[in-house]
């Protein structure tokens, strides 16, 4: 049965459509031609397409595909980018608060130790910030340096304030004594354990979010192969060559083509699912000593207790150190004077009243819930793209890549394609190098997330508050406790239910698809706004 002649015997409609893609009409035949040079839209009769038009269609098809892919990932990408920025900023705020709490503790309880103590505390928390951001710093060394620096000041100002000036040049000896005599008992070790566990988890959490952005960026900017371009052209544009301008591709046919084009991308699916589930497990374990907010905001109390421990043993220590450091002739050490106010951010010490209380942990859990709605993102991509490009409903009266059919049959379509292009070959090629690289990175972060030594999930008792604490107790596992009795100290029971200072008035609707990062407003107190809830078919 001969194919029906093109409805438009003059190729007029094809010309006007093609002009929108490519100004000028020199490549479009005025009337149907045999098209023997065509390589993609193989004609069954006269055609309104030329070889040059075919090339332009292929280019356009690949660009369309890239745009569809970018719009498919826009919401997910924005979700991760925004949260990575939010958490990084929030962690910085926690560190700043922790530093100010510690400085305030020194100012209120040990004014004679300031300003040197402020200096050492500042250096310690700077290192904490750098570590969270990925710097190659050893946490144990940070804590040791803090105590090594503090002890000489404690000894000369608190334990032995009557020391003559000539005896003040014993700092190195005192630093050594701090270690040899274990003057702070097990407090440095306690702080190391807590700080290293909580910072390690925080650091990997941020690393994981940044890798999530990298994964989306990689797949977002994939360049599709020429083979894929040919398949897309056959699906979207070859019908035009026959003058069938209003015909839509069959849905089933679209799925077959998309699965072929995206075979490499879909290979990410397994590792993406594992990434989200591993991240969820990490987040579920981020409490008590695995929660940097909890640990760092309690540090001032533990440091205070450690100084009290030294004071309690002052008699014995003074005698021993008197003998040990009697002949030290190290260079005299005098700290420059710093005004105390320089080190305490007054506004941080105000108790912030936040109407809609929101902790970092609730924010993390909210992020995980949203991410879980994207767990099938990669496996659902082919279907999503088909549902967001014109396809015929119910697979009736639609284009199957070669002709207009009453009903789409996958088998017939595959058979018809065999002599033009082998779909199976495309699938067999395997993922592109960039996809393989990102899969390797996902495997690596998944392994890191899994090997984090953390409690397996969280079961809260009815009596426990949202943070898993009961007053005066440490819940079901002492390992998760934070040290410090903090006699007479402010107790920071509520974590920074602050996210004060950190306002992100962002609406997904207004958000660009690319990497616009949110910037915090300067308000002293405000709360996070929920991300707009855009529901895509991927969810």
């Amino acid at each position: 049965q001969p194919p029906p002649p093109p409805p438009d015997a003059t190729c007029h409609q094809v010309r006007s459509f093609f002009q929108r893609l490519q100004p000028g009409l020199k490549w479009v035949p005025e009337t149907p031609v045999p098209g023997s040079d065509l390589q993609v839209c193989l004609p069954k009769g006269p055609t309104c397409c030329s070889r040059k038009m075919e090339e332009k269609y292929q280019l356009t098809a690949r660009l369309n595909m890239e745009q569809l892919l970018q719009s498919a990932s826009m919401e997910l990408k924005f979700l991760i980018i925004q949260n990575a920025a939010v958490f990084q900023e929030a962690f910085e705020i926690v560190v700043r608060h922790a530093k100010n709490y510690t400085n305030a503790m020194f100012k209120n309880n040990y004014p004679s130790l300031t300003p040197q103590a402020f200096e050492f505390v500042g250096e310690f928390f700077t290192d904490v910030s750098l570590y969270i951001l990925g710097s190659d710093i050893n946490v144990d060394d940070m804590v040791n340096e803090l105590f090594d620096s503090l002890f000489p000041v404690i000894y000369t100002q608190l334990m032995n304030p009557g020391l003559p000036d000539s005896a003040l040049d014993i700092n190195e000896c005192l630093r050594g004594a701090r270690r040899d005599l274990k003057v702070f008992g097990n407090f440095p070790k306690l702080i190391m354990t807590q700080v290293s566990k909580s910072l390690q988890v925080t650091r990997i959490f941020l690393q994981a979010l940044n890798l999530g952005i990298e994964v989306i960026n990689t797949t977002d900017h994939l360049k599709f192969s020429k083979d894929c371009g040919r398949m897309l052209t056959r699906m979207w544009y070859c019908s035009y060559c026959q003058g069938l301008m209003m015909v839509k591709p069959c849905g089933g046919y679209c799925n077959v083509v998309m699965q072929g084009c995206m075979a490499g991308v879909v290979e990410i699916d397994k590792y993406w699912r594992e990434y989200i589930l591993s991240l969820e497990e990490l987040v579920n374990g981020m409490y008590r000593i695995y929660d940097m907010e909890n640990v760092l905001l309690g540090l001032f109390s533990t440091i205070h207790d450690s100084i009290q421990y030294v004071q309690k043993n002052a008699g014995k220590l003074t005698t021993t150190i008197g003998k040990l450091c009697a002949h030290s002739q190290q260079r005299q050490y005098r700290s420059a004077y710093y005004p105390e106010d320089l080190f305490i951010d007054k506004k941080v010490l105000k108790v912030a009243h936040v109407e809609h209380e929101e902790t970092l942990s609730s924010r993390r859990r909210e992020l995980i819930q949203k991410l879980k709605s994207f767990i099938s993102f990669y496996s659902a991509l082919p279907g999503y793209i088909c549902s967001h490009s014109p396809v015929a409903e119910n697979d009736t009266l639609c284009w199957n890549g070669q002709e207009l059919v009453e009903r789409y049959s996958q088998k017939a379509a595959r058979n018809g394609m065999k002599n033009q292009f082998n779909l199976h070959e495309l699938k067999m090629k395997g993922p592109e190098p960039v996809v393989s690289q990102i899969i390797d990175k996902l495997k690596h972060i998944n392994q890191l997330l899994r090997t984090m030594s953390m409690p397996k999930g969280r079961v809260l008792d009815k009596n426990l508050d949202e943070e898993g604490f009961e007053s005066g107790d440490c819940g079901d596992d002492e390992d998760e406790c934070i040290g410090g009795s903090g006699d007479g100290m402010i107790k920071v029971k509520n974590q920074l239910r602050f996210l004060a200072e950190l306002a992100y008035d962002l609406d997904v609707d207004d958000a660009p698809g690319n990497s616009q990062q949110a910037t915090p407003k300067d308000n002293e107190i405000s709360t996070f706004h929920n991300l707009g809830n855009v529901h895509s078919p991927l969810k």
């Epitope: 050594g176 270690r179 040899d180 274990k182 008992g185 097990n186 070790k189 440490c474």
Partner: antibody, heavy 123, light 107 residues
């Protein structure tokens, strides 16, 4: 392999002093603390004191006035001396090592123990 | 000083059974707790430190746990060599103190 060998008298007269030497091998006293623990007949364990890798010492308060612990790193030996012994000081005395490297500068559990020295205080 | 209270004082069990020893600290010792086994006529041997970490060479049938100021040592599937006396000891602050011990006997 790691060993802690104790040597000392089995019998001490009341009001006399007890001296025990603990010689270690398989590790260095530069990064191990040596504790002394005793066990009275039919009783539990009692911690007496420790000499740390850096040379500092800590003692259990009831024994502070009559106990002295020192060491010679070059000979890998730790010396325990307790004065004014009474009958109720009769016990097995153990030396026990705990890691004390330049890492934590804190306290650790005792992972190596000597064979014990059985001491009887009697006239 | 921290007191360490061990319970029960003695316990009878058969090979293959599961037993649990408990040790309560009089204050917060921040997980700085060790468990030792002492067989008749022998020196104590470290089993667990930092409340939960098994010492080198200790079989996995031993496990330590913590809840508040109460610490536990659990042995599943008792073996003949597991019988003896078990002591807990804190190493949070000087003086380190031991519990009074739990004697595990063959039923």
């Amino acid at each position: 392999q790691v060993q802690l060998k104790q040597s000392g008298p089995g019998l001490v007269q009341p009001s006399q002093s007890l001296s025990i030497t603990c010689t270690v091998s398989g590790f260095s006293l530069n990064n191990y603390g040596i504790n002394w623990v005793r066990q009275s007949p039919g009783k539990g364990l009692e911690w007496l004191g420790v000499v740390w890798s850096g040379g500092g010492t800590d003692y259990n308060a009831p024994f502070i006035s009559r106990l002295s612990i020192s060491k010679d790193n070059s000979k890998s030996q730790v010396f325990f001396k307790m004065s004014s012994l009474q009958v109720d000081d009769t016990a097995i005395y153990y030396c026990a090592g705990n890691p004390d490297s330049d890492h934590y500068y804190g306290y650790e559990a005792m992972d190596y123990w000597g064979q014990g020295t059985s001491v009887t205080v009697s006239s | 000083d921290f007191q360490m209270t061990q319970s029960p004082a003695s316990l009878s069990a058969s090979v293959g059974e599961t037993v649990t020893f408990t040790c309560r600290a009089s204050g917060d010792i921040h997980n700085f707790l060790a468990w030792y086994q002492q067989r008749q006529g022998k020196s104590p041997q470290l089993l667990v430190y930092n409340a939960k970490t098994l010492a080198d060479g200790v079989p996995s049938r031993f496990s330590g746990s913590a809840s508040g100021t109460q610490y536990s040592l659990k042995i599943i599937s008792l073996q003949p060599e597991d019988f003896g006396t078990y002591y807990c000891q804190h190493f949070w602050t000087i003086p380190f103190t031991f519990g009074s011990g739990t004697k595990l006997e063959i039923k």
